[in-house]
Interface confidence: low
């Protein structure tokens, strides 16, 4: 890959730690001001795989706070609005990072962790098993 | 809300810009190891709105890989395989916490940032604008 | 820490004109929709108009033509332009803003901030 | 526009009571719901939205329920700083639009 130069101006990293332990700035930039508003969306109501989301909070991870798609039906909403069960309702979900307090009630140290969320949901075609 | 007693084990926590420069622990734990597998799924393909998978990478960045979801149609896959205009396909979207090295090209120096993914897609029905 | 202030309100004269501003500090405003919601004197609540982080609007019926909403992103600003005012417009109006949730797509359509609001009486 | 009917209007109650408010919808909102506390001359308070999620810093006595077009905020057990006027709020549509308000009064 690329190596890039060090940066004369970087924390002093002599830690015996490092480079597992790192110095983190909490103050959360944004880097979404330009983004598409759509987010701010109705598409859990909209879908033809519709889902709810559920609160999950943790005071001793950051972000406390994270939400969890879960699909309202089995199968789909058709054009008629009723549920066809020929499709199937699935969850999207991927792996993110968050920071949970360690040793636990720590102000200020955390270790970085990866969960895995469901964002939404989709409409998929369902895997026929045929039996020979 | 619950006042959690402090550790008395924690890190010495006097810097002048705590609380918002924190210790981090790079050693990922993973919470996933019993979730689903489906996670790596074919859903994108066998959705009916389809998306492709787009790379992201950025060396100053941690996780420097990002996984992108952009939509194959602006319509929906139907039950002929064809696209269907009256229902469109869209991004489901998410924020996510990054980190981003601060300074730059520093191994041990971070700043927490938030960024939005496309994770998968949906298929949804279109809001109609009635002209009066 | 999420704040919303509004100014602007006061008299004025049935066919009158008046313009509201709401001062919004503590969140990235541009990303978010904003609301105006208005309350008459020992009535209910009453949402007057949505707008959406690109621009676009929505407008109860009774005030359709006679009001306009917009925004300044770069002021953190957001506007309520009242035209051709009516002694049933009287009410206090409040500038909502939507949850400051970021984790996971949640949606944000509803008001979970407001204003100290600002008193219009519309009065000959 | 899609029309809330909040039941009862006014209702007196005691300390230590358990409280519903019921909000109907004239057709349905499926879960976009949300329940509101006003005191005099204050702004309005978000207590519960989408139907059934506690608003950060609601006390837990508060809980929301329904779905579709009927829907219900419950108080397990009145407290004094709990009488107030509370509304729900639909904004499934536009224009969105809010019940006339049932004020909780003390007995």
């Known amino acids: 890959g690329i190596t890039i130069p060090r940066n004369p101006g970087c924390p002093n990293s002599e830690d015996k730690n490092f480079p597992r332990t790192v110095m983190v700035n909490l103050n959360i930039h944004n880097r979404n001001t330009n983004t598409n508003p759509k987010r701010s969306s109705d598409y859990y109501n909209r879908s033809t795989s519709p889902w709810n989301l559920h609160r999950n909070e943790d005071p001793e991870r950051y972000p406390s706070v994270i939400w969890e798609a879960k699909c309202r039906h089995l199968g789909c909403i058709n054009a008629d609005g009723n549920v066809d069960y020929h499709m199937n309702s699935v969850p999207i979900q991927q792996e993110i990072l968050v920071l949970r307090r360690e040793p636990p009630h720590c102000p200020n140290s955390f270790r970085l962790e990866k969960i895995l969320v469901s964002v939404g949901c989709t409409c998929v075609t369902p895997i026929v098993h045929h039996v020979a | 809300g619950i006042t959690i007693p402090r550790n008395p084990g924690c890190p010495n926590s006097e810097d002048k810009n705590f609380p918002r420069t924190v210790m981090v622990n790079l050693n990922i734990h993973n919470r996933n190891t019993n979730t689903n597998p489906k996670r790596s799924s074919d859903y994108y393909n066998r959705s009916t709105s389809p998306w492709n998978l787009h790379r992201n990478e950025d060396p100053e960045r941690y996780p420097s890989v990002i996984w992108e979801a952009k939509c194959r149609h602006l319509g929906c896959i139907n039950a002929d395989g064809n696209v269907d205009y009256h229902m469109n396909s869209v991004p489901i979207q998410q924020e996510i916490l990054v980190l981003r090295r601060e300074p730059p090209h520093c191994p041990n120096s971070f700043r927490l940032e938030k960024i939005l993914v496309s994770v998968g897609c949906t298929c949804v029905t279109p809001i109609v604008h009635h002209v009066a | 820490e999420v704040q919303l202030v509004e100014s602007g309100g006061g008299l004025v004269q049935p066919g009158g004109s008046l313009r509201l501003s709401c001062a919004a500090s503590?969140?990235?405003?541009?990303?978010?929709?904003m609301a105006w919601v208005r309350q008459a004197p020992g009535k209910g609540l009453e949402w007057v108009a949505t707008?959406?982080?690109?621009?676009?609007?929505y407008y109860r019926d009774s005030v359709k033509g006679r009001f306009t909403i917009s925004r300044d992103n770069a002021k953190n600003s957001l506007y309520l332009q009242m035209n051709s005012l009516r002694a049933e417009d009287t009410a206090v109006y409040y500038c909502?803003?939507?949850?400051?949730?970021?984790?996971?797509?949640?949606?944000?359509?509803?008001?979970?901030?407001w204003g100290q609001g600002t008193l219009v009486t519309v009065s000959s | 526009d899609i029309q809330l009917t909040q039941s009862p209007s006014s209702l007196s109650a005691s300390v230590g009571d358990r409280v519903t408010i019921t909000c109907r919808a004239d057709?349905?909102?499926?879960?976009?719901m949300h329940w509101y506390q006003q005191k005099p001359g204050k702004a309005p308070k978000l207590l519960i939205y989408?139907?059934?999620n506690s608003e950060i810093g609601v006390p837990d006595r508060f809980s929301g329920s329904g779905s579709g077009t009927d829907f219900r905020l419950t108080i397990s057990s009145l407290q004094p700083e709990d009488f107030a006027t509370y509304y729900c709020?639909?904004?499934?549509?536009?224009?969105?639009?809010f019940g006339q308000g049932t004020k909780v009064e003390i007995k």
């Open positions: 707008i959406g982080p690109s621009g676009d609007t």
């Open positions: 989408l139907v059934s």
């Open positions: 057709e349905s909102v499926r879960t976009l």
């Open positions: 503590g969140f990235p405003f541009s990303d978010y929709s």
């Open positions: 909502a803003s939507p949850p400051q949730y970021y984790e996971g797509s949640i949606p944000r359509l509803w008001p979970a901030h």
């Open positions: 709020l639909q904004t499934h549509s536009y224009p969105y639009t």
